[in-house]
């Protein structure tokens, strides 16, 4: 399906609006420090060029690849060396090495200022003054902070962002209308970014096979009535889409995602009964809806798995003929029967099955050797079940904030070398598993909890990879994608860690804490808690609780005082002294 001009092909397929938006996202994800105006200029130049190619596909340079065109454009940025340092060296390379180089320089934690939300009237004015610039700025700010954000999904977020402003800026109470919508978009956006980051990590660190295995399991749970061949086709197409997006090929990715949504909707009778509503929506909503669609009902009277995968005398023959196809069928059959299992558990079971066949099919009596393979699954299933049960009980007992604190302590003791901001961010997100998943019935708890934890632990892995400080983190992150969570769960207190020197400045607080939002105040307190554990890794729960209770009382007292700053200075010194005494520092 070769086109004379790839850029003309994508421009025609996507339309000018989506083309411009996707090019802006691509550029902002590569050059995360560049000012908005510079990116807009580059995008406009690329768009004008694309239009000349649409008019005449044989025109000069129209036959060049998108990577060549986009890379050449990015390399025209005057301040590349000053702003990005060694990333400028990418420009000396030829494609495809140049694009790979740009990809390697994507920064998961760019040094960018926090996005501050202006007053509602100010936002509405900006929206009304220039809607197009306002929405482009949204794409730019999200893309540069989340360099792996799933681009076609970001278009969907931008559409909702526009709708929120269109609706709320004409509402009687603009703030009451707009702020909850913006909060929802922010939270969903962070979740979407993290989920996509795991997909990209899976592809880039563990390869296409790992991603395909994940996709087989997830799609089989979602579409249990679909035939294996149908699921396999969807997996192949979905893998192509995500490979493209993770590789920076955003135009191809968006185009192929639209084709996949079209195919799914044209073939919904052989895929799932739950797709009807999704397929009536416009493109962006349709693709989002399909990605989030609930699991279809399992077909009635599915036969036992043992017949084909344990009892059959042809197991080794079938396995030898086409190993990945046979394992894929096993995963498909197991997953469609178990919507109550997490995807990572299903992948662990498939790995155990594969290991058993590798061993047993070379044995004297293969059947005798693998006859009890399903018994090996029992402990693998029980481990996450028990862990979730225990943690949900703890969550229900403590509430989200204190549950997060328990996890902060737990993870700081496991990997104290990790930076405090990372430990706070990751532990807070781990703690959110409680309110997200513990409310579900038993049958939905594990897929909710363990697959969410995989996403959060991947955040830890990608942040740690940027500046590695802990061999234990590196080990858990790189050895096995599906065993990351069990690996972290199994970590005990790091006995090799030398406690951090005590620094009173770390525990010095000022009156500005009083004006912070509840969330920001929690983060301050949780930051202090991590630092406490780093100073005193052997502190007991009781000791830490006492210090944290004193700290909360101190903040409350000083925030009520007439002279807040003096209170923080004087009472703060007393608190530090008392805490040192309590912890034996």
């Amino acid at each position: 399906d070769a086109h004379k001009s790839e850029v003309a092909h994508r421009f025609k397929d996507l339309g000018e609006e989506n083309f411009k938006a996707l090019v802006l996202i691509a550029f902002a994800q590569y050059l995360q420090q560049c000012p908005f105006e510079d990116h807009v200029k580059l995008v406009n130049e690329v768009t004008e060029f694309a239009k000349t190619c649409v008019a005449d596909e044989s025109a000069e340079n129209c036959d060049k690849s998108l990577h060549t065109l986009f890379g050449d454009k990015l390399c025209t940025v005057a301040t590349l060396r000053e702003t990005y340092g060694e990333m400028a060296d990418c420009c000396a390379k030829q494609e495809p090495e140049r694009n790979e180089c740009f990809l390697q320089h994507k920064d998961d934690n760019p040094n960018l200022p926090r996005l501050v939300r202006p007053e509602v009237d100010v936002m509405c004015t900006a929206f009304h003054d220039n809607e197009e610039t306002f929405l482009k700025k949204y794409l730019y700010e999200i893309a540069r902070r989340h360099p792996y954000f799933y681009a076609p999904e970001l278009l969907f977020f931008a559409k909702r962002y526009k709708a929120a402003f269109t609706e709320c800026c004409q509402a009687a109470d603009k703030a009451a209308c707009l702020l909850p919508k913006l909060d929802e978009l922010r939270d969903e956006g962070k979740a979407s970014s993290a989920k996509q980051r795991l997909k990209c990590a899976s592809l880039q660190k563990f390869g296409e096979r790992a991603f395909k295995a994940w996709a087989v399991a997830r799609l089989s749970q979602r579409f249990p009535k679909a035939e294996f061949a149908e699921v396999s086709k969807l997996v192949t197409d979905l893998t192509k889409v995500h490979t493209e997006c993770c590789h920076g090929d955003l135009l191809e990715c968006a185009d192929d995602r639209a084709d996949l949504a079209k195919y799914i909707c044209e073939n919904q009778d052989s895929i799932s009964s739950k797709l009807k509503e999704c397929c009536e929506k416009p493109l962006l909503e349709k693709s989002h809806c399909i990605a989030e669609v609930e699991n279809d009902e399992m077909p009635a009277d599915l036969p036992s798995l043992a017949a084909d995968f344990v009892e059959s005398k042809d197991v080794c023959k079938n396995y030898a003929e086409a190993k990945d196809v046979f394992l894929g069928m096993f995963l498909y059959e197991y997953a469609r029967r178990h919507p109550d299992y997490s995807v990572v558990l299903l992948l662990r079971l498939a790995k155990t099955y594969e290991t058993t066949l590798e061993k047993c099919c070379a044995a004297a009596d293969p059947h005798e050797c693998y006859a009890k393979v399903f018994d090996e699954f029992k402990p693998l299933v029980e481990e996450p079940q028990n862990l979730i049960k225990q943690n949900c009980e703890l969550f229900e007992q403590l509430g989200e904030y204190k549950f997060q604190n328990a996890l902060l302590v737990r993870y700081t003791k496991k990997v104290p070398q990790v930076s405090t901001p990372t430990l706070v961010e990751v532990s807070r997100n781990l703690g959110k598993v409680g309110s997200k998943c513990c409310k579900h019935p038993e049958a939905k708890r594990m897929p909710c909890a363990e697959d969410y934890l995989s996403v959060v632990l991947n955040q830890l892995c990608v942040l740690h990879e940027k500046t590695p400080v802990s061999d234990r983190v590196t080990k858990c992150c790189t050895e096995s994608l599906v065993n990351r969570r069990p690996c972290f769960s199994a970590l005990e207190v790091d006995e090799t860690y030398v406690p951090k020197e005590f620094n009173a400045e770390t525990f010095t607080f000022h009156a500005d804490i009083c004006t912070l939002s509840e969330k920001e105040r929690q983060i301050k307190k949780q930051t202090a808690l991590v630092e406490l554990v780093k100073h005193k890794p052997k502190a007991t729960k009781e000791q830490l609780k006492a210090v944290m209770d004193d700290f909360a009382a101190f903040v409350e007292k000083c925030c009520k005082a007439d002279d807040k700053e003096t209170c923080f200075a004087e009472e703060g010194k007393k608190l530090v002294a008392a805490s040192q005494a309590a912890l034996g520092l």
């Epitope: 509602v120 009237d121 509405c124 004015t125 609706e167 004409q170 603009k174």
Partner: antibody, heavy 124, light 108 residues
Framework: EVQLLQSGAEVKEPGASVKVSCKAS????????ISWVRQAPGQGLEWVGR????????GYAQRLQGRVTMTTDTSTSIAYMEVRSLRSDDTAVYYC?????????????????WGQGTMVTVSS | DIVLTQSPSSLSASVGDRVTITCRAS??????LNWYQQKPGKAPKLLIY???SLQSGVPSRFSGSGSGTDFTLTISSLQPEDFATYYC??????????FGQGTKLEIK
């Protein structure tokens, strides 16, 4: 050119209902709210209510609550205001007006474009 | 509800005069105040929004000022076409958006 064109004058008996229409043109209808204002003969302006043309949310003046309903048809860019159980003191010129956009960092909800008005007479 | 009181209720002035109309709110409304002009038999027309911003197309002889509870509309040099009734309107509180009772400006 931004315009609001209202339906013609109506004469109604007490207890009846009246439905006034307001056809918008020259702008994206669902991006601007619509307010309704009335003016009794020789009197000042009285705010009747408003409708969010994007989601259909409404807000009405207390004294008309329960008797007035505002709706829109986005496919035709028309706003409607219906008043039921008409009384003689509902006799007035009814205006539709567009709620202006936020400017210079403030959303003053100024009524920047007005219809020509519809005279509603309630008389037995 | 927020009550707006305009003063004077009516006034007579001559072409070329400087005229000031005031509008007082029963509670602070920040800058959420608009001014309209209405001529007999016609729909009102927006002059000033957000207390002091001139609506496009409105002559610069019209100006608005004030914030909180006290606001003024000033016509720096009265023209023949300016004889009309002027209304202030607040949009601070969520509905109802109240109007002042109006100020009738007549030729002396």
């Amino acid at each position: 050119e931004v315009q609001l064109l209202q339906s013609g004058a109506e004469v109604k008996e007490p207890g009846a209902s009246v439905k006034v229409s307001c056809k918008a043109s020259g702008y994206t209808f669902s991006s601007y709210g619509i307010s309704w204002v009335r003016q009794a003969p020789g009197q000042g302006l009285e705010w009747v209510g408003r409708i969010n043309t994007y989601n259909g949310n409404t807000g009405y003046a207390q004294r008309l609550q329960g008797r007035v309903t505002m709706t829109t048809d986005t496919s035709t860019s028309i706003a409607y205001m219906e008043v039921r159980s008409l009384r003689s003191d509902d006799t007035a010129v009814y205006y539709c007006a567009r709620l202006g956009h936020c400017q210079r960092g403030i959303c003053s909800d100024a009524l920047d474009t007005w219809g020509q008005g519809t005279m509603v007479t309630v008389s037995s | 509800d927020i009550v707006l009181t305009q003063s004077p209720s009516s006034l007579s002035a001559s072409v070329g005069d400087r005229v000031t109309i005031t509008c007082r709110a029963s509670q602070s409304i920040s800058s959420y105040l608009n001014w309209y002009q209405q001529k007999p038999g016609k729909a009102p027309k927006l002059l000033i929004y957000a207390a002091s911003s001139l609506q496009s197309g409105v002559p610069s002889r019209f100006s608005g000022s004030g914030s909180g509870t006290d606001f003024t509309l000033t016509i720096s040099s009265l023209q023949p076409e300016d004889f009309a009734t002027y209304y202030c309107q607040q949009s601070y509180s969520t509905p109802p958006y109240t109007f002042g009772q109006g100020t009738k400006l007549e030729i002396k």
